[in-house]
């Protein structure tokens, strides 16, 4: 008789992260017999959907099907056909869709309805598309990074070398920056969480966690830029906005209607004597930083201490993983190294922002000009948010670890979301690890 390789006893899961600027599909894989072990789920594929975020399809929902096709077809290729019907698919939409829902619940529902119909056509076990809350986004990001870092288990981890190795079981805090919102989540040290909205209680693997989380809607990097422009154009004497957050020589025409399209700029809205204005970059980090600080209201705090806009924030505690756009922006700027101090980061940002636009374009020819033009703002915004918004200091800066992936899995909320929805994080520590039967006939 012929020796046949026994089929791998594995399971798969798919999560689509429908963010404000784009959608990404993640495929996860794990050994079927070890579902309740910590650290066994890993990412096998990321497929970035080509095009904008799903909220941009509000006027052309007929294009959502074609938009999702390529990545869903990719999932069909990656996951063995025999597993298709039992592979769950989840879509979570974040702040871009939260903003659309604020504008019109009906339009948001229409987009989600078409997304659901499109995803239902595939041979997987589609579990639904929904807008997750900011609190969920923060919590699942925190779960993801701590799961991947092996923080939830006393047992030996399944991988040998953990980056950011700390020999204790102290969890990492999570800092997530998107296009439309930003989340901060961590376990404070013996501190009462004064605002119930920001408190989460978890029991994971037999241990209790009291977690602080907050999601700042409109403070993702893209919406923060719209806010800054709306604020600054109020005091511009004409339709020229000399902007320190863009490189010298950079010019861009902005439609006032686009500026006021988002709910995030409503507080700055006013009748302007022009339909368009031109941004003219002057590339000055210090002035850019000052302009950004005006977006944070620090004059009012009904608690013992706040981040900004009257939102409670306990004293920072422990190490933090900063991911998503925190990582992408800092990686582009070559500022993710643990050896780079906060003072050095500031110095580098000053130099970067002062570089002429033509020079920047030549140096980074392969980067989309829209993104390229915004790195000065985004880098400055990250510094402002972390230092003045969340109260990191030059000393505590070294506790921020800019993380893209941990052991091959992207840092972000999607893994935590799937672990939760597939009940793969038990409340109690499993009594014993079941033996693997995959090697026996």
């Amino acid at each position: 008789t012929q020796n046949k390789a026994l089929p791998e006893n594995v399971k798969y899961g798919i999560v689509l992260d429908a963010g404000s600027s784009h959608t990404s599909l993640y495929i996860y894989k794990w050994p079927a017999e070890k579902e309740n072990d910590t650290g066994v789920v890993h990412q096998v594929e990321e497929c970035r959907v080509k095009g904008p975020g799903i909220s941009k399809f509000v006027q052309k929902v007929n294009e959502i099907g074609i938009y999702l096709t390529d990545c869903m077809e990719r999932a069909r290729e990656v996951i063995p056909r025999s597993q298709h019907q039992e592979t769950p698919v989840y879509l979570g939409a974040t702040a871009g869709m939260r903003l659309l829902r604020m504008e019109s619940e009906e339009l948001a529902d229409r987009v989600l309805d078409v997304v659901e119909r499109s995803l239902s056509n595939y041979p997987f076990d589609f579990q639904g598309a929904r807008i997750i809350t900011g609190q969920e986004e923060g919590a699942y990001g925190w779960i993801t990074i701590n799961y991947l870092l092996g923080k939830f288990s006393q047992k030996t981890r399944w991988f040998s070398i953990v980056p950011y190795e700390t020999n204790n079981q102290e969890t990492f805090g999570a800092l997530d920056l998107g296009g439309a919102s930003t989340q901060v989540t961590f376990v404070p040290q013996n501190q009462t969480i004064e605002s119930p909205d920001n408190a989460l209680q978890f029991r994971l693997y037999g241990k209790d966690y009291n977690v602080y989380t907050h999601s700042f809607l409109c403070y993702g990097k893209d919406q923060a830029l719209w806010q800054k422009l709306a604020k600054d154009i109020q005091v511009a004497s004409n339709e020229i906005l000399r902007d320190p957050c863009f490189h010298p020589g950079y010019k861009k025409v902005v439609n006032v209607s686009d500026l006021y399209k988002t709910p995030c700029t409503k507080r700055f809205e006013m009748t302007l004597p022009f339909q368009q204005f031109e941004i003219q970059g002057i590339g000055n980090y210090q002035q850019c930083h000052q302009s950004i600080l005006e977006l944070f209201n620090t004059s009012y705090c009904p608690y013992s201490q706040c981040a900004f806009n009257g939102i409670f924030l306990p004293p920072l505690q422990g190490d933090f993983g900063a991911f998503s756009a925190f990582y992408f922006v800092m990686k582009f700027l070559n500022l993710t190294s643990e050896k780079v101090s906060q003072e050095k980061v500031t110095e580098m940002m000053k130099k970067f922002c002062a570089q002429p636009w033509e020079e920047i374009k030549t140096s980074y020819a392969g980067v989309k000009e829209k993104y390229l033009s915004e790195y000065c703002f985004s880098g400055t915004y990250i510094l402002s948010l972390l230092l003045q918004g969340y109260h990191f200091t030059a000393d505590s800066w070294e506790h921020i670890h800019f993380i893209g992936k941990i052991q091959g899995s992207d840092a972000g909320w999607t893994l935590g979301y799937m672990l939760n929805l597939t009940n793969m994080i038990p409340a109690e520590q499993p009594l014993s690890t079941p033996l693997s039967h995959s090697t026996y006939v």
Epitope: R48, K50, G51, P52, F57, D70, N121, G366, K368
Partner: antibody, heavy 119, light 109 residues
């Protein structure tokens, strides 16, 4: 705005290979599927294949499967199409093109590269 | 493979309606989306997208151009025709990679 600039005209002998480049400015090639289409003199458009520069994944038309190789270089934002074992009927204008991205209304094409195969 | 068949040539007077047809085998419909596009090509120039997803007008294209159809039968209509519309017109499917029709030569009388 997005622009696709292709390499210059080529004259090749039968049996030789040709490598045509297509440099994209104004956007990253990873945002698109990049296609190659050719057009023989006085004839219609013929699709040759595509590459997804995000993952270097390629799909080729059956007719060209054994002779064409498409590659990309994200550091220079350039895609390449190499056609081997050239014959006279490969004389054509070769175009690179982006696939229209859902949510946006148009696509982009290079200016075309004339490849002449003659002994 | 998906095969596209176009009417070969058409001569129209300015101000009149021009109708170009394209038949596909098999269908280019997929889960409720119709993957049919139309291009215009003038001599010495690359093709220019006119219509995508059977009936959506591409950016910057005059409203004189319209597309219709689903399944296997499609039409590109130019109404009214202008002298500048002299060109070759190609249908293209993008349901399963790309295939082009043979082209329709439109002449303005």
């Amino acid at each position: 705005q997005v622009q696709l600039v292709q390499s210059g005209a080529e004259v090749k002998k039968p049996g030789a290979s040709v490598k045509v480049s297509c440099k994209v400015s104004g956007d990253s090639i990873t945002a698109y599927f990049m296609h190659w289409v050719r057009q023989a003199p006085g004839k219609g458009l013929e699709w040759m294949g595509r590459i997804d520069p995000d993952h270097e994944r390629t799909k080729y038309a059956e007719k060209f499967k054994n002779r064409v190789t498409m590659t990309s270089d994200t550091s220079t934002n350039t895609v390449y199409m190499e056609l081997s074992s050239l014959r006279s009927e490969d004389t054509a204008v070769y175009y690179c093109a982006t696939e229209r991205v859902p949510g946006f209304e148009t696509d982009y094409w290079g200016q075309g590269t004339m490849v002449t195969v003659s002994s | 493979d998906i095969v596209l068949t176009q009417s070969p040539a058409l001569a129209v007077s300015p101000g009149q309606r021009a109708t170009i047809t394209c038949r596909t085998n098999p269908t280019v419909d997929h889960y409720g989306t119709t993957y049919m596009n139309w291009y215009q090509q003038k001599p010495g120039q690359p093709p220019k997208l006119l219509i995508y997803l059977a009936s959506s007008l591409a950016s910057g294209v005059p409203a004189r151009f319209s597309g219709s159809g689903s399944g296997t039968d499609f039409t590109l209509t130019i109404n009214p025709v202008e002298a500048d519309d002299t060109a070759n017109y190609y249908c293209q499917q993008s349901r399963n990679l790309w295939t082009f029709g043979g082209g329709t030569k439109v002449e303005i009388k």
